[in-house]
Protein backbone atom coordinates (compact mmCIF):
# COMPACT_ATOMS: atom_id res chain seq x y z
CA UNK A 1 0.00 0.00 0.00
CA UNK A 2 1.20 3.72 -1.29
CA UNK A 3 2.37 5.63 1.35
CA UNK A 4 0.86 9.41 2.19
CA UNK A 5 2.02 11.70 -0.88
CA UNK A 6 1.76 15.64 -0.40
CA UNK A 7 1.25 16.59 -3.60
CA UNK A 8 2.16 20.43 -4.94
CA UNK A 9 2.00 20.32 -8.66
CA UNK A 10 3.25 23.51 -9.70
CA UNK A 11 7.03 24.29 -9.09
CA UNK A 12 6.03 27.95 -9.61
CA UNK A 13 3.12 30.37 -9.83
CA UNK A 14 3.89 33.88 -10.65
CA UNK A 15 1.04 36.73 -9.57
CA UNK A 16 0.19 40.16 -10.48
CA UNK A 17 0.42 41.90 -7.43
CA UNK A 18 -3.07 43.03 -5.75
CA UNK A 19 -4.61 39.90 -7.72
CA UNK A 20 -5.44 36.42 -5.90
CA UNK A 21 -2.64 33.73 -6.15
CA UNK A 22 -4.08 29.86 -5.93
CA UNK A 23 -1.52 27.69 -4.48
CA UNK A 24 -2.58 23.62 -5.39
CA UNK A 25 -1.76 21.02 -2.99
CA UNK A 26 -3.51 17.50 -2.81
CA UNK A 27 -2.80 14.52 -0.35
CA UNK A 28 -3.48 10.77 -1.87
CA UNK A 29 -4.82 9.42 1.34
CA UNK A 30 -7.00 11.00 4.33
CA UNK A 31 -4.80 9.09 6.65
CA UNK A 32 -3.24 9.21 8.98
CA UNK A 33 -5.40 11.90 10.64
CA UNK A 34 -4.71 15.64 11.63
CA UNK A 35 -3.97 18.62 9.91
CA UNK A 36 -2.61 20.18 6.69
CA UNK A 37 -0.96 23.43 7.11
CA UNK A 38 1.01 25.81 4.98
CA UNK A 39 4.40 27.68 5.62
CA UNK A 40 6.40 29.98 3.94
CA UNK A 41 9.86 29.55 3.60
CA UNK A 42 11.39 25.58 5.35
CA UNK A 43 13.49 25.20 9.26
CA UNK A 44 12.89 26.85 12.21
CA UNK A 45 12.04 30.14 10.96
CA UNK A 46 9.36 29.14 8.30
CA UNK A 47 6.01 31.49 8.71
CA UNK A 48 2.67 29.77 9.15
CA UNK A 49 0.36 30.97 6.60
CA UNK A 50 -2.91 29.01 7.31
CA UNK A 51 -3.99 26.09 9.71
CA UNK A 52 -6.96 23.69 8.52
CA UNK A 53 -7.33 23.07 12.55
CA UNK A 54 -7.08 26.44 13.82
CA UNK A 55 -6.57 30.10 13.73
CA UNK A 56 -7.65 33.38 11.72
CA UNK A 57 -6.34 34.09 8.55
CA UNK A 58 -8.03 36.80 7.07
CA UNK A 59 -6.91 36.79 3.95
CA UNK A 60 -6.27 32.84 3.23
CA UNK A 61 -9.33 30.53 2.62
CA UNK A 62 -9.15 27.23 1.59
CA UNK A 63 -10.72 26.48 -2.35
CA UNK A 64 -12.49 23.60 -1.11
CA UNK A 65 -14.42 22.92 1.41
CA UNK A 66 -12.21 21.24 4.17
CA UNK A 67 -14.82 20.00 6.73
CA UNK A 68 -16.31 18.32 3.34
CA UNK A 69 -16.22 14.53 3.96
CA UNK A 70 -13.22 12.68 1.97
CA UNK A 71 -11.38 16.12 1.48
CA UNK A 72 -8.16 15.49 -0.33
CA UNK A 73 -7.54 18.81 -1.79
CA UNK A 74 -5.91 21.55 0.61
CA UNK A 75 -5.58 24.33 -1.88
CA UNK A 76 -5.55 27.78 -0.50
CA UNK A 77 -5.91 31.33 -1.92
CA UNK A 78 -4.19 33.91 -0.75
CA UNK A 79 -5.76 37.74 -1.40
CA UNK A 80 -4.60 40.91 -2.23
CA UNK A 81 -1.01 39.85 -3.63
CA UNK A 82 1.76 41.84 -2.28
CA UNK A 83 5.38 42.09 -3.62
CA UNK A 84 5.76 40.82 0.07
CA UNK A 85 3.95 37.75 -0.14
CA UNK A 86 6.75 36.20 -2.89
CA UNK A 87 8.61 33.37 -1.67
CA UNK A 88 8.21 29.39 -1.45
CA UNK A 89 5.31 28.13 0.11
CA UNK A 90 4.94 24.29 1.43
CA UNK A 91 1.93 22.30 2.19
CA UNK A 92 2.84 20.45 5.38
CA UNK A 93 0.46 17.27 6.60
CA UNK A 94 0.60 16.47 10.31
CA UNK A 95 -0.35 13.65 12.37
CA UNK A 96 -2.78 13.99 15.06
CA UNK A 97 -0.82 14.22 18.57
CA UNK A 98 -0.25 16.55 21.60
CA UNK A 99 1.69 19.02 20.17
CA UNK A 100 0.79 17.55 15.91
CA UNK A 101 4.12 15.58 14.54
CA UNK A 102 4.72 16.89 11.05
CA UNK A 103 4.28 13.96 8.64
CA UNK A 104 5.57 14.91 5.15
CA UNK A 105 6.12 17.86 3.42
CA UNK A 106 5.13 19.11 -0.73
CA UNK A 107 7.84 19.55 -2.79
CA UNK A 108 6.50 23.71 -2.61
CA UNK A 109 5.97 26.23 -4.81
CA UNK A 110 7.20 29.47 -5.10
CA UNK A 111 4.77 32.22 -5.81
CA UNK A 112 6.48 35.20 -7.57
CA UNK A 113 4.54 38.58 -7.50
CA UNK A 114 4.63 40.72 -10.35
CA UNK A 115 4.84 44.53 -9.49
CA UNK A 116 4.45 47.30 -11.86
CA UNK A 117 6.98 50.33 -11.82
CA UNK A 118 6.34 53.26 -10.17
CA UNK A 119 5.83 55.82 -12.83
CA UNK A 120 9.58 57.12 -13.68
CA UNK A 121 9.82 60.57 -11.88
CA UNK A 122 12.89 62.71 -14.46
CA UNK A 123 14.76 65.31 -12.35
CA UNK A 124 17.34 67.56 -13.76
CA UNK A 125 20.12 69.77 -12.65
CA UNK A 126 19.84 71.87 -9.28
CA UNK A 127 21.08 75.15 -11.43
CA UNK A 128 20.90 76.04 -14.66
CA UNK A 129 23.70 75.51 -17.43
CA UNK A 130 24.93 77.14 -20.82
CA UNK A 131 25.09 75.80 -24.02
CA UNK A 132 27.68 73.54 -24.68
CA UNK A 133 27.33 72.13 -21.18
CA UNK A 134 26.59 69.01 -20.00
CA UNK A 135 23.93 68.09 -17.45
CA UNK A 136 22.92 65.24 -16.00
CA UNK A 137 19.28 63.71 -15.42
CA UNK A 138 17.96 61.49 -13.05
CA UNK A 139 15.30 58.65 -13.57
CA UNK A 140 13.75 56.75 -10.72
CA UNK A 141 11.36 53.68 -10.60
CA UNK A 142 10.15 51.93 -7.93
CA UNK A 143 8.52 48.83 -6.43
CA UNK A 144 8.57 46.20 -9.94
CA UNK A 145 8.99 42.56 -9.72
CA UNK A 146 10.79 40.69 -11.69
CA UNK A 147 13.96 42.38 -11.72
CA UNK A 148 14.48 41.86 -15.09
CA UNK A 149 13.72 45.78 -16.61
CA UNK A 150 14.56 47.99 -19.85
CA UNK A 151 14.95 51.50 -19.61
CA UNK A 152 16.12 53.75 -21.71
CA UNK A 153 16.86 57.72 -22.42
CA UNK A 154 15.38 59.92 -25.82
CA UNK A 155 15.93 63.38 -26.42
CA UNK A 156 13.93 64.49 -28.98
CA UNK A 157 13.03 61.33 -30.00
CA UNK A 158 16.77 60.32 -30.62
CA UNK A 159 18.37 57.56 -27.79
CA UNK A 160 21.15 59.02 -25.32
CA UNK A 161 24.14 56.90 -25.06
CA UNK A 162 25.93 58.48 -22.43
CA UNK A 163 23.93 56.43 -19.55
CA UNK A 164 24.92 55.04 -16.33
CA UNK A 165 21.90 52.61 -14.93
CA UNK A 166 21.61 50.53 -11.58
CA UNK A 167 18.59 48.05 -10.39
CA UNK A 168 18.70 47.37 -6.41
CA UNK A 169 19.32 45.04 -4.74
CA UNK A 170 21.57 43.45 -6.33
CA UNK A 171 20.40 40.18 -4.59
CA UNK A 172 17.12 38.56 -3.99
CA UNK A 173 14.11 40.74 -2.86
CA UNK A 174 10.30 40.87 -3.16
CA UNK A 175 10.42 44.82 -5.17
CA UNK A 176 13.52 46.66 -7.43
CA UNK A 177 14.06 49.98 -7.93
CA UNK A 178 15.82 51.79 -10.81
CA UNK A 179 17.90 54.44 -11.15
CA UNK A 180 19.38 56.01 -13.95
CA UNK A 181 21.48 59.06 -15.12
CA UNK A 182 22.14 60.32 -18.60
CA UNK A 183 24.73 63.22 -19.11
CA UNK A 184 23.12 65.64 -21.69
CA UNK A 185 25.25 68.17 -23.88
CA UNK A 186 23.38 71.37 -23.85
CA UNK A 187 22.70 73.56 -27.42
CA UNK A 188 21.29 76.89 -27.60
CA UNK A 189 18.65 75.60 -29.67
CA UNK A 190 17.47 73.21 -26.47
CA UNK A 191 15.15 75.50 -24.83
CA UNK A 192 12.16 73.78 -26.60
CA UNK A 193 13.83 70.14 -26.40
CA UNK A 194 12.77 67.24 -23.76
CA UNK A 195 14.48 64.31 -22.14
CA UNK A 196 12.41 61.29 -21.92
CA UNK A 197 13.36 58.01 -19.59
CA UNK A 198 11.54 55.10 -21.05
CA UNK A 199 11.08 52.18 -18.56
CA UNK A 200 9.67 48.70 -20.19
CA UNK A 201 8.84 45.80 -17.80
CA UNK A 202 6.69 42.58 -18.38
CA UNK A 203 3.63 43.96 -15.92
CA UNK A 204 3.24 46.85 -18.38
CA UNK A 205 2.51 44.63 -21.51
CA UNK A 206 4.76 46.15 -23.85
CA UNK A 207 3.41 49.88 -22.91
CA UNK A 208 6.02 51.37 -21.56
CA UNK A 209 6.08 53.96 -18.96
CA UNK A 210 7.71 57.33 -19.49
CA UNK A 211 8.60 60.10 -17.69
CA UNK A 212 9.56 63.49 -18.92
CA UNK A 213 11.94 66.76 -18.39
CA UNK A 214 11.87 69.55 -20.23
CA UNK A 215 15.26 71.00 -20.84
CA UNK A 216 13.79 74.44 -20.47
CA UNK A 217 14.12 73.51 -16.82
CA UNK A 218 17.89 73.18 -17.28
CA UNK A 219 19.59 75.41 -19.46
CA UNK A 220 20.52 79.51 -19.81
CA UNK A 221 21.07 80.88 -22.92
CA UNK A 222 23.12 84.07 -22.60
CA UNK A 223 21.72 87.10 -24.80
CA UNK A 224 23.81 88.74 -27.44
CA UNK A 225 24.26 92.39 -27.19
CA UNK A 226 24.08 95.15 -30.06
CA UNK A 227 23.52 99.09 -29.38
CA UNK A 228 22.92 100.92 -32.36
CA UNK A 229 22.16 104.37 -32.93
CA UNK A 230 19.80 105.86 -35.02
CA UNK A 231 20.00 109.08 -37.09
CA UNK A 232 20.02 112.52 -35.23
CA UNK A 233 16.50 113.68 -34.89
CA UNK A 234 16.19 117.60 -35.94
CA UNK A 235 14.88 118.37 -32.29
CA UNK A 236 18.75 117.57 -31.33
CA UNK A 237 17.37 114.05 -29.76
CA UNK A 238 19.26 111.03 -31.02
CA UNK A 239 17.85 107.51 -30.35
CA UNK A 240 20.08 104.59 -29.49
CA UNK A 241 18.54 101.41 -29.70
CA UNK A 242 19.93 98.06 -26.94
CA UNK A 243 19.44 94.81 -28.70
CA UNK A 244 18.98 92.07 -26.58
CA UNK A 245 18.83 89.07 -28.79
CA UNK A 246 18.40 84.76 -28.13
CA UNK A 247 18.14 84.81 -24.22
CA UNK A 248 16.48 82.53 -22.07
CA UNK A 249 14.94 82.45 -19.59
CA UNK A 250 12.88 85.95 -20.03
CA UNK A 251 14.00 86.71 -16.54
CA UNK A 252 16.44 89.63 -17.50
CA UNK A 253 17.13 93.37 -16.32
CA UNK A 254 18.50 96.18 -18.75
CA UNK A 255 19.89 99.35 -17.37
CA UNK A 256 20.98 102.10 -19.00
CA UNK A 257 24.37 104.37 -18.29
CA UNK A 258 25.05 107.75 -19.40
CA UNK A 259 28.56 108.35 -18.33
CA UNK A 260 28.47 106.15 -15.60
CA UNK A 261 25.34 107.11 -14.45
CA UNK A 262 22.37 105.33 -14.04
CA UNK A 263 19.70 106.68 -16.92
CA UNK A 264 16.67 103.82 -16.44
CA UNK A 265 16.48 100.86 -15.39
CA UNK A 266 13.78 98.16 -17.02
CA UNK A 267 12.57 94.50 -16.25
CA UNK A 268 11.91 92.07 -19.26
CA UNK A 269 7.93 90.66 -19.23
CA UNK A 270 5.54 89.18 -21.38
CA UNK A 271 8.24 89.38 -24.30
CA UNK A 272 6.92 86.98 -27.57
CA UNK A 273 8.83 84.30 -27.80
CA UNK A 274 10.48 82.81 -30.62
CA UNK A 275 10.70 79.71 -32.67
CA UNK A 276 13.38 77.84 -30.56
CA UNK A 277 11.69 79.27 -27.90
CA UNK A 278 14.43 82.26 -26.86
CA UNK A 279 13.41 85.46 -26.17
CA UNK A 280 14.52 88.89 -27.89
CA UNK A 281 14.17 92.45 -26.37
CA UNK A 282 14.73 95.76 -28.06
CA UNK A 283 15.12 98.37 -25.55
CA UNK A 284 15.72 102.21 -26.89
CA UNK A 285 17.35 105.62 -25.25
CA UNK A 286 16.62 109.09 -26.52
CA UNK A 287 19.92 111.24 -25.69
CA UNK A 288 19.32 115.04 -26.18
CA UNK A 289 22.70 116.22 -27.39
CA UNK A 290 22.38 120.14 -27.10
CA UNK A 291 22.51 119.33 -23.59
CA UNK A 292 25.90 118.15 -23.66
CA UNK A 293 29.18 119.75 -24.32
CA UNK A 294 31.41 116.64 -24.57
CA UNK A 295 30.28 113.16 -26.39
CA UNK A 296 28.43 110.77 -24.32
CA UNK A 297 29.05 107.22 -23.27
CA UNK A 298 26.36 104.96 -23.64
CA UNK A 299 25.77 101.70 -21.74
CA UNK A 300 23.76 99.26 -21.98
CA UNK A 301 24.23 96.77 -19.33
CA UNK A 302 22.40 94.05 -19.15
CA UNK A 303 21.75 91.09 -15.98
CA UNK A 304 20.47 87.86 -16.86
CA UNK A 305 19.22 84.95 -14.99
CA UNK A 306 21.09 86.32 -12.15
CA UNK A 307 24.11 85.93 -13.53
CA UNK A 308 27.37 88.29 -13.29
CA UNK A 309 26.17 91.64 -15.87
CA UNK A 310 27.37 92.26 -19.61
CA UNK A 311 27.89 95.67 -20.76
CA UNK A 312 27.88 96.95 -24.56
CA UNK A 313 28.75 100.55 -24.59
CA UNK A 314 28.43 103.21 -27.33
CA UNK A 315 29.79 106.65 -27.68
CA UNK A 316 27.03 109.39 -29.16
CA UNK A 317 29.63 112.13 -30.61
CA UNK A 318 29.01 115.49 -29.43
CA UNK A 319 29.88 118.28 -32.46
CA UNK A 320 31.29 121.45 -31.23
CA UNK B 1 -20.96 2.13 -1.27
CA UNK B 2 -21.32 -0.20 0.76
CA UNK B 3 -19.20 -2.02 3.69
CA UNK B 4 -20.08 -5.67 5.00
CA UNK B 5 -18.50 -7.64 8.06
CA UNK B 6 -18.01 -11.29 8.09
CA UNK B 7 -15.71 -13.44 10.11
CA UNK B 8 -17.78 -13.30 13.26
CA UNK B 9 -18.97 -16.39 15.64
CA UNK B 10 -18.77 -18.53 18.42
CA UNK B 11 -14.85 -18.54 20.37
CA UNK B 12 -13.88 -19.93 23.13
CA UNK B 13 -12.16 -18.13 26.20
CA UNK B 14 -8.52 -17.81 25.33
CA UNK B 15 -9.43 -18.14 21.58
CA UNK B 16 -8.55 -16.37 18.59
CA UNK B 17 -10.59 -15.19 15.83
CA UNK B 18 -10.06 -12.74 12.53
CA UNK B 19 -12.72 -10.58 10.96
CA UNK B 20 -13.09 -9.18 7.90
CA UNK B 21 -14.34 -5.74 6.37
CA UNK B 22 -15.01 -5.58 2.28
CA UNK B 23 -15.48 -2.44 0.60
CA UNK B 24 -17.91 -2.54 -2.53
CA UNK B 25 -18.09 0.41 -4.23
CA UNK B 26 -15.40 2.50 -3.07
CA UNK B 27 -11.73 2.05 -2.57
CA UNK B 28 -9.94 1.59 1.40
CA UNK B 29 -6.43 3.07 0.03
CA UNK B 30 -6.96 6.79 1.13
CA UNK B 31 -9.06 5.91 3.66
CA UNK B 32 -8.80 4.34 7.31
CA UNK B 33 -11.10 2.09 8.30
CA UNK B 34 -12.31 2.13 11.80
CA UNK B 35 -13.30 -0.68 14.28
CA UNK B 36 -16.44 -0.23 16.95
CA UNK B 37 -18.01 -2.72 18.69
CA UNK B 38 -21.24 -2.81 20.61
CA UNK B 39 -21.70 -5.16 23.81
CA UNK B 40 -25.26 -6.61 24.00
CA UNK B 41 -27.43 -3.90 25.43
CA UNK B 42 -24.52 -1.73 25.95
CA UNK B 43 -23.30 1.41 24.22
CA UNK B 44 -20.55 1.76 21.36
CA UNK B 45 -16.57 1.32 22.48
CA UNK B 46 -14.10 2.36 20.05
CA UNK B 47 -11.41 -0.21 19.45
CA UNK B 48 -8.89 1.26 16.71
CA UNK B 49 -8.51 2.21 13.07
CA UNK B 50 -7.04 0.56 10.10
CA UNK B 51 -4.41 2.82 8.00
CA UNK B 52 -1.15 1.62 6.30
CA UNK B 53 1.16 -0.85 7.78
CA UNK B 54 2.68 1.59 9.81
CA UNK B 55 -0.41 3.65 10.81
CA UNK B 56 -2.63 1.45 12.59
CA UNK B 57 -3.83 2.47 16.22
CA UNK B 58 -5.45 1.04 18.78
CA UNK B 59 -7.21 2.21 21.92
CA UNK B 60 -5.67 1.30 24.90
CA UNK B 61 -7.54 -1.55 26.42
CA UNK B 62 -6.93 -2.68 23.00
CA UNK B 63 -3.79 -3.02 22.61
CA UNK B 64 -1.75 -5.87 22.24
CA UNK B 65 -4.61 -8.55 21.76
CA UNK B 66 -5.85 -6.82 18.55
CA UNK B 67 -4.28 -5.98 15.94
CA UNK B 68 -5.09 -5.07 12.26
CA UNK B 69 -4.10 -4.96 8.34
CA UNK B 70 -5.97 -3.50 5.38
CA UNK B 71 -5.95 -4.04 1.27
CA UNK B 72 -7.31 -1.53 -1.20
CA UNK B 73 -10.83 -3.59 -0.68
CA UNK B 74 -10.88 -5.16 2.82
CA UNK B 75 -9.72 -4.55 6.43
CA UNK B 76 -8.93 -7.33 8.81
CA UNK B 77 -8.76 -7.11 12.90
CA UNK B 78 -7.34 -9.78 14.26
CA UNK B 79 -8.81 -10.74 17.80
CA UNK B 80 -6.96 -12.64 19.98
CA UNK B 81 -6.91 -13.68 23.33
CA UNK B 82 -10.21 -13.68 23.56
CA UNK B 83 -12.64 -13.17 27.39
CA UNK B 84 -16.35 -13.74 27.64
CA UNK B 85 -16.48 -9.51 27.53
CA UNK B 86 -15.48 -9.37 24.18
CA UNK B 87 -18.74 -10.79 23.54
CA UNK B 88 -20.33 -7.95 21.15
CA UNK B 89 -21.27 -6.88 17.86
CA UNK B 90 -18.35 -5.74 15.99
CA UNK B 91 -18.86 -2.99 13.31
CA UNK B 92 -16.08 -1.69 10.81
CA UNK B 93 -16.56 1.96 9.53
CA UNK B 94 -14.94 4.38 6.92
CA UNK B 95 -13.04 6.89 8.79
CA UNK B 96 -10.07 7.60 10.83
CA UNK B 97 -12.41 10.32 12.61
CA UNK B 98 -11.56 14.38 13.53
CA UNK B 99 -12.09 15.38 9.55
CA UNK B 100 -13.03 12.16 8.44
CA UNK B 101 -15.76 10.79 10.35
CA UNK B 102 -17.00 7.47 10.80
CA UNK B 103 -19.42 6.43 7.88
CA UNK B 104 -20.33 4.83 6.33
CA UNK B 105 -20.71 1.66 8.84
CA UNK B 106 -20.56 -2.25 7.95
CA UNK B 107 -24.17 -4.10 9.59
CA UNK B 108 -21.46 -5.22 12.24
CA UNK B 109 -20.73 -9.09 13.00
CA UNK B 110 -21.26 -10.80 16.49
CA UNK B 111 -18.55 -12.45 18.12
CA UNK B 112 -19.76 -14.26 21.27
CA UNK B 113 -17.23 -15.85 23.37
CA UNK B 114 -18.43 -18.44 25.83
CA UNK B 115 -17.29 -21.94 26.40
CA UNK C 1 -7.86 9.34 27.89
CA UNK C 2 -10.82 11.68 27.40
CA UNK C 3 -13.99 11.02 29.13
CA UNK C 4 -17.23 11.79 27.09
CA UNK C 5 -20.19 12.57 29.39
CA UNK C 6 -23.68 12.62 27.67
CA UNK C 7 -27.06 14.07 29.54
CA UNK C 8 -29.30 13.19 29.54
CA UNK C 9 -28.87 9.14 29.55
CA UNK C 10 -32.45 8.79 28.18
CA UNK C 11 -35.86 11.43 27.51
CA UNK C 12 -39.76 11.43 26.47
CA UNK C 13 -40.53 13.47 24.18
CA UNK C 14 -43.41 13.97 21.68
CA UNK C 15 -43.18 14.62 17.49
CA UNK C 16 -42.81 18.18 16.75
CA UNK C 17 -41.07 18.68 20.21
CA UNK C 18 -37.43 20.38 20.42
CA UNK C 19 -34.82 18.39 22.02
CA UNK C 20 -31.41 19.22 22.81
CA UNK C 21 -28.46 16.60 24.33
CA UNK C 22 -25.42 17.46 25.90
CA UNK C 23 -22.04 15.79 25.40
CA UNK C 24 -19.30 17.15 27.86
CA UNK C 25 -15.28 15.94 27.42
CA UNK C 26 -13.55 16.07 30.22
CA UNK C 27 -10.62 18.09 28.72
CA UNK C 28 -10.57 19.94 24.93
CA UNK C 29 -11.35 17.66 22.51
CA UNK C 30 -8.34 17.93 19.42
CA UNK C 31 -8.69 21.14 17.55
CA UNK C 32 -11.64 22.07 19.87
CA UNK C 33 -13.65 20.22 17.45
CA UNK C 34 -12.93 16.87 17.15
CA UNK C 35 -16.92 15.56 18.47
CA UNK C 36 -19.31 13.72 15.94
CA UNK C 37 -23.16 12.32 16.94
CA UNK C 38 -24.29 9.46 15.61
CA UNK C 39 -27.71 7.92 16.00
CA UNK C 40 -28.83 4.57 16.07
CA UNK C 41 -32.09 2.24 15.80
CA UNK C 42 -31.97 -1.28 17.38
CA UNK C 43 -30.88 -4.14 15.45
CA UNK C 44 -28.93 -1.17 12.98
CA UNK C 45 -25.53 0.09 12.91
CA UNK C 46 -24.91 3.92 13.82
CA UNK C 47 -25.53 6.45 11.17
CA UNK C 48 -23.45 9.85 10.96
CA UNK C 49 -25.16 13.11 11.67
CA UNK C 50 -23.25 15.32 12.85
CA UNK C 51 -18.94 15.97 12.82
CA UNK C 52 -16.76 18.17 13.16
CA UNK C 53 -18.87 19.75 16.27
CA UNK C 54 -20.97 21.36 13.68
CA UNK C 55 -21.10 19.94 10.00
CA UNK C 56 -24.16 18.19 8.81
CA UNK C 57 -22.71 14.93 7.10
CA UNK C 58 -24.58 14.38 3.83
CA UNK C 59 -28.39 13.18 3.85
CA UNK C 60 -28.94 14.18 7.31
CA UNK C 61 -32.38 16.62 7.96
CA UNK C 62 -31.39 19.89 8.85
CA UNK C 63 -33.20 20.07 11.77
CA UNK C 64 -30.22 18.15 13.17
CA UNK C 65 -27.83 21.02 14.19
CA UNK C 66 -24.69 20.67 16.51
CA UNK C 67 -23.02 23.38 18.49
CA UNK C 68 -20.22 23.89 20.61
CA UNK C 69 -16.47 24.24 21.23
CA UNK C 70 -13.74 22.43 23.68
CA UNK C 71 -15.27 20.81 25.61
CA UNK C 72 -19.09 21.73 25.99
CA UNK C 73 -20.97 20.28 22.73
CA UNK C 74 -24.73 19.98 22.00
CA UNK C 75 -27.23 17.69 19.47
CA UNK C 76 -30.34 19.69 18.84
CA UNK C 77 -33.19 18.29 17.18
CA UNK C 78 -35.55 21.38 16.37
CA UNK C 79 -38.46 19.57 15.19
CA UNK C 80 -39.00 15.91 16.82
CA UNK C 81 -40.05 13.47 13.67
CA UNK C 82 -41.25 9.89 14.38
CA UNK C 83 -38.64 7.92 12.40
CA UNK C 84 -36.07 10.30 14.90
CA UNK C 85 -36.93 7.78 17.82
CA UNK C 86 -33.14 6.57 18.22
CA UNK C 87 -30.13 6.27 20.89
CA UNK C 88 -27.53 9.52 19.93
CA UNK C 89 -23.96 8.55 20.58
CA UNK C 90 -21.38 11.40 20.98
CA UNK C 91 -17.46 10.30 19.82
CA UNK C 92 -14.94 12.85 20.84
CA UNK C 93 -11.12 12.55 19.83
CA UNK C 94 -8.48 13.57 22.39
CA UNK C 95 -5.25 14.58 21.35
CA UNK C 96 -3.81 11.58 20.72
CA UNK C 97 -4.90 9.32 17.69
CA UNK C 98 -5.84 6.42 19.18
CA UNK C 99 -7.68 8.73 21.90
CA UNK C 100 -11.48 8.29 20.57
CA UNK C 101 -14.30 7.69 22.86
CA UNK C 102 -18.33 7.54 23.01
CA UNK C 103 -20.40 8.75 25.56
CA UNK C 104 -22.91 6.27 27.03
CA UNK C 105 -25.77 7.60 24.73
CA UNK C 106 -29.21 9.53 25.31
CA UNK C 107 -31.83 7.09 24.19
CA UNK C 108 -34.94 9.48 22.55
CA UNK C 109 -38.28 7.97 23.11
CA UNK C 110 -42.20 8.50 22.49
CA UNK C 111 -44.24 10.22 25.68
Known amino acids: EEELQVIQPEKSVSVAAGDSATLNCTVSSLIPVGPIQWFRGAGPGRELIYNLKEGHFPRVTAVSDPTKRNNMDFSIRISNITPADAGTYYCVKFRKGSPDVELKSGAGTELSVRAKPSAPVVSGPAVRATAEHTVSFTCESHGFSPRDITLKWFKNGNELSDVQTNVDPAGKSVSYSIRSTARVLLTRRDVHSQVICEVAHVTLQGDPLRGTANLSEAIRVPPFLEVTQQSMRADNQVNVTCQVTKFYPQRLQLTWLENGNVSRTEMASALPENKDGTYNWTSWLLVNVSAHRDDVKLTCQVEHDGQPAVNKSFSVKVSA | RQLVESGGGLVQPGGSLRLSCTAS????????ISWVRQAPGKGLEYIGT?????ITYFASWAKGRFTGSKTSSTAYMELSSLRSEDTAVYFC????????????WGQGTLVTVSS | DIVMTQSPSSLSASVGDRVTITCQASQSVYGNNDLAWYQQKPGQAPKLLIYLASTLATGVPSRFSGSGSGTDFTLTISSLQPEDFATYYC???????????FGQGTKVEIK
Open chain 2, 25 to 32: GFSLSSHG
Open chain 2, 93 to 104: ARGSAWNDPFDP
Open chain 2, 50 to 54: IGTGV
Open chain 3, 91 to 101: LGGGDDEADNT
